[in-house]
């Protein structure tokens, strides 16, 4: 049996788009869609959109949740509408995260 | 300090296979994408593929898609790539290379390993 | 597959002077683009990511530019250590595609 290699799933969907970086778009096609809180010089900065570029969801979905930010991503259309990321309860240790750049 | 130490020169068959190493430090790579990439002697760089260590799933060039295999070990934080059905088309160095959200891009890359093959 | 075409293929110049190479995709890539240098006998070194920005470590001296299909390089007073060849990734699109190459040597 020849051994097939498993291929990228590399659906488009269409996904919720709410943030500054949406611009005056409210949805946005990508391969991935996410819901993020971020904390931002004090502010809960709640941002929704799409990942483009399938390594770049890769990376930053699998990125754990740190005190100062979350995201939770899911491949479906308008799947994000639902999400609301959420940071870590106190007392739970995490490792650190990097922040990631949306386009 | 984050290193990715491959393994050595291979002078290999027409024919054969060959399994090449990449020994992450500093890091672990399941919090990575680790890339193989491919240079012939003067030419310039061809992107073969990734794994996400964490999950083991795989995405290649389709140049490559017949020809290499890539697969990583976590709990020796190490990447493998193989090659098989080698040809005189396959000497090169081969280097392997993380992708972080860092950079999102490849931003640690290992020595090379040089692949000859000769009959 | 999406085309990196890098020009020019080699380029001379001497200490002190400035450089720029250019990278055109085959169709838009947004900024994920990357910029490498490579040494003979050695790896490739990032030192530019998402078109602009500068890698950790890399001097001030080196910078990118661009967007869409359009990027560019440049090194500014040149150093010794910087003859070397270069080369443009994009990141957009599997397969990852790199530019030939730009090998710039001493004048």
């Known amino acids: 049996v020849e051994d097939e290699k498993p291929k990228v799933n590399q659906k488009l969907y269409m996904c919720v788009c709410e943030g500054l970086s949406c611009g005056n778009e409210d949805h946005c096609e990508g391969q991935q869609c996410f819901s993020s809180l971020s904390i931002n010089d004090g502010f809960h900065v709640y941002q929704k959109g799409c990942f483009q570029v399938y390594e770049q969801g890769k990376m930053t979905c699998k990125t754990p949740p740190s005190p100062g930010q979350a995201v939770e991503c899911c491949q479906g259309d308008w799947c994000n509408r639902n999400i609301t990321a959420q940071l870590p309860t106190k007392g739970k240790s995490f490792p650190g995260t990097q922040n990631f750049h949306l386009e | 300090e984050v290193q990715l130490q491959q393994s050595g020169a291979e002078l290999v068959r027409p024919g054969a296979s060959v399994r090449l190493s990449c020994t992450a430090s500093g890091f672990n790579i399941k919090d990575s994408l680790m890339h193989w990439v491919k240079q012939r002697p003067e030419q310039g760089l061809e992107w073969i593929g990734w794994i996400d260590p964490e999950d083991g799933e795989t995405k290649y060039a389709p140049n490559f898609q017949d020809k290499a295999t890539i697969t990583a070990v976590t709990s020796s934080n190490t990447a493998y790539l193989q090659l098989s059905s080698l040809t005189s088309e396959d000497s090169a160095i081969y280097y392997c290379?993380?992708?972080?959200?860092?950079?999102?891009?490849?931003?640690?890359w290992g020595q090379g390993t040089s692949v000859t093959v000769s009959s | 597959d999406i085309q990196m075409t890098q020009s020019p293929a080699s380029q001379s110049a001497s200490l002190g002077e400035s450089v720029t190479f250019t990278c055109l995709a085959s169709?838009?890539?947004?900024?994920?683009l990357a910029w490498y240098q490579q040494k003979p006998g050695k790896s490739p070194q990032l030192l530019i990511y998402a078109a602009t920005s500068l890698a950790d470590g890399v001097p001030s001296r080196f910078s990118g530019s661009g967007s869409g299909t359009k990027f560019s390089f440049k090194i500014s007073s040149l150093q010794a250590e910087d003859f070397a060849s270069y080369y443009c990734?994009?990141?957009?699109?599997?397969?990852?595609?790199f530019g030939g190459g730009t090998k710039l040597e001493i004048k």
């Open positions: 290379a993380r992708y972080t959200s860092d950079y999102y891009t490849m931003d640690y």
């Open positions: 169709q838009t890539i947004g900024t994920w």
């Open positions: 990734q994009q990141l957009y699109s599997t397969p990852w595609t």
